[in-house]
Interface confidence: low
């Protein structure tokens, strides 16, 4: 640091005083000296180190009407808002031909209640799930015991002797208030109050109960959620992109998710005016009076391809001998998936049920067995996919064939005389 | 029964601003999505604009991004298609339509009956 | 954006024949959701097929779709006088959810 030489008296005529105060305080340093000859710039130094942004006026009085007469030069230094940054040794500096002078020191201090660096914050947490809070107090004057209180009631029979910095809570199951004291030798400042909400935990084991095509039902297991019974449920289901969607390098905007709030108990929903076939990411989240508890994961699922809504249409079954011609139209109804065939069924008013299955045709030559005498057969269809058979249409008499009817050519389809498959007849 | 009510349009001067409504009733329009398409004279089908069950994602074609804005009032049960700096290219007839299915990307299975827009000075 | 070009743009036929339609996407149209659409003069479209091979309720079984990826077919098994119209296909998997230009189908 800048030493002053002896070689000369010091031009210093008054040298700063002491400041010591609280936190905030505005205070002024102030230094005169007297000079021959023109008037130097005075520099600040705060333990030894020249202030470049100090705050400082400067005001010069000249004591005769030459400029080589002596001046009266005061600087002084405004401190605004007190900071521990502040505190230490002040000096004034000046240059005076090739002498450097410095000023007696002064002092700033700080001295006053504690001042909080951190305090409690407002939080939300799930019932009965551990969380830390954070307090932090300095001075001077040192030392300073922090005392935490939770709802207004001490946690510590002392300051000092609860925990400090930090304060561990195993968890709650009602929304509590919190906040801490800091005690010195002036006094003892309150934080902010801390209210700590508490909220339903995130609930589990969400699964599917049940699919169909069009509509999904769910379920879950609730989390705790304190003294605050649930009010609702809230599931939502999106159309999942498989990564599909994508153009021009960029997906597309998410889809908003389709949101059903579920009454509770029971904690399951039925989610309907699904597309068939397709993949959904679902997830769900339970409210009480405090609010809404964290959503679980999205837990991909798939509607499943659906059975044909309705029977085939406009069947009709004509016997010329021994052959009977079946033939049908695919059905009117959604499909709800890949119609993968037919299947029909035959029988006679003595005869077991014959089921066979057509695959994608709609028309099938069926060779009767026997002398031609099977009485009051019957024809029933239907059609299926991955998921099963649709509805079957109602049984359809065999009408005898006229002369002049048309009559397609169709594979025949030879029955063994033991039928495969053997169906009781509805 | 679903129906689809469309109203809003007329004749408005190139740059000029035009709101359509669409009047929902027979489904539960807060449950769908809900698009416009257009169709000018003697002219295909483009796709407008589309908007989530919500409102909180709206889909735009090229053509009108930055000047048409969708929105909805599901209290009301109506779409909205608000269309500013109108242009002459943007004459058709205008229809609300409803998806199958709860999300944006759905067929379109039920339609208003049209509201034409004729933009020209 | 997914472009699709319909192919014939117009067809001529006569009634009790079949007609097939072609509807081709610039890129593959995410988990086949294309629809197909019939419109006549003065009306409003109406929706014939999704998700390119469900019938739509209400729809006779002479209308079938078919295809997926880029390619997509629209069959009417046995033309009668009411399906002589404009038919439209529609991609709804990308945004923006783009129309195909159309096929008029017309009486020959």
């Known amino acids: 640091a800048p030493r002053g030489t002896q070689a000369e008296e010091s031009p210093f005529v008054g040298n700063p005083g002491n400041i010591t105060g609280a936190r905030g305080l505005t205070g002024t340093l102030r230094c005169q000296l007297q000079v021959q000859g023109e008037p130097p710039e005075v520099h600040w130094l705060r333990d030894g180190q020249i202030l470049e942004l100090a705050d400082s006026t400067q005001t010069q009085v000249p004591l005769g009407e030459d400029e080589q007469d002596d001046w009266i030069v005061v600087s002084q230094l405004r401190i605004t808002s007190l900071q521990l940054s502040d505190t230490g040794q002040y000096q004034c500096l000046v240059f005076l031909g090739h002498q450097t002078f410095v000023s007696q020191p002064g002092y700033v201090g700080l001295e006053g209640l504690p001042y909080f660096l951190e305090e409690p914050e407002d939080r939300t947490v799930a019932a009965n799930t551990p969380f830390n809070l954070s307090c932090q107090a300095q001075g001077p004057p040192e030392p300073v015991d922090l005392l935490w209180l939770q709802d207004a009631v001490p946690l510590a029979t002392a300051p000092g002797h609860g925990p400090q910095r930090s304060l561990h809570v195993p968890g709650l199951n009602k929304t509590s208030s919190f906040s801490c004291e800091a005690h010195n030798a002036k006094g003892v400042t309150t934080s902010r109050t801390a209210t700590i909400t508490v909220l339903p935990q995130q609930p589990r084991n969400l699964h599917l109960v049940s699919r169909q095509p069009t509509e999904l039902e769910v379920a879950w297991t609730p989390g705790l959620s304190g003294i605050y019974p649930l009010t609702h449920c809230t599931l939502q289901a999106v159309l999942s992109d498989d990564g599909m969607g994508i153009q021009a390098g960029e997906p597309d905007p998410p889809e908003e998710p389709l949101t059903s709030q579920a009454s509770v108990p029971p904690h399951q929903l039925r989610l309907g005016s699904l597309h068939p076939h397709t993949p959904y990411h679902i997830r769900v989240a339970c409210t009480s009076s405090q609010g809404p508890s964290s959503w679980t994961h999205w837990l991909p699922v798939e509607t499943p391809e659906g059975v044909p809504l309705g029977p085939p249409e406009n069947i009709s079954a004509t016997r010329n001998g021994s052959q009977a011609f079946v033939h049908w139209q695919e059905p009117r109804a959604p499909l709800q998936g890949t119609l993968l065939g037919y299947r029909l069924a035959y029988q006679g008013q003595d005869t077991p049920e014959v089921l066979m299955d057509i695959g994608l045709r709609q028309e099938v030559t069926l060779e009767l067995q026997g002398d031609g005498s099977v009485s009051n057969l019957t024809v029933c269809v239907a059609a299926y996919t991955a998921a099963g058979d649709g509805p079957w249409s109602l049984p359809v008499p065999l009408e005898a064939w006229r002369p002049g009817q048309a009559q397609p050519v169709h594979q025949l389809v030879k029955e063994p005389s033991t039928p495969a498959f053997s169906w009781p007849w509805w | 029964e679903v129906q689809l009510l469309d109203s809003g349009g007329g004749l408005v001067q190139p740059g000029g601003s035009l709101r359509l409504s669409c009047a929902a009733s027979?489904?539960?329009?807060?449950?769908?999505?809900m698009s416009w398409v257009r169709q000018a004279p003697g002219k295909g089908l483009e796709w407008v604009s589309a908007?989530?069950?919500?409102?909180?994602?709206?889909y735009y074609a090229d053509s009108v991004k930055g000047r048409f804005t969708i929105s909805r009032d599901n209290s009301k049960n109506t779409l909205y298609l608000q269309m500013n700096s109108l242009r002459a290219a943007d004459t058709a007839v205008y229809y609300c339509?409803?998806?199958?299915?709860?999300?944006?990307?759905?067929?379109?299975?039920?339609w208003g009956q049209g509201a034409l827009v004729t933009v020209s000075s | 954006e997914i472009v699709l070009t319909q192919s014939p743009g117009t067809l001529s036929l006569s009634p009790g024949e079949r007609a097939t339609l072609s509807c081709r996407a610039s890129q593959s149209v995410s988990n086949s959701y294309l629809a197909w659409y019939q419109q006549k003069p003065g009306q409003a479209p109406r929706l014939l097929i999704y998700g390119a091979s469900s019938r739509a309720t209400g729809i006779p079984d002479r209308f079938s779709g078919s295809g997926s990826g880029t390619d997509f077919t629209l069959t009417i098994s046995r033309l009668e006088p009411e399906d002589f119209a404009v038919y439209y296909c529609?991609?709804?998997?990308?945004?923006?959810?783009?129309f195909g230009q159309g096929t008029k189908l017309e009486i020959k």
């Open positions: 339509a409803k998806p199958g299915f709860i999300m944006v990307r759905g067929p379109l299975d039920y």
């Open positions: 908007i989530s069950i919500g409102g909180g994602n709206a």
């Open positions: 027979g489904f539960t329009f807060s449950s769908y999505a």
């Open positions: 529609q991609q709804y998997g990308s945004s923006p959810y783009t």
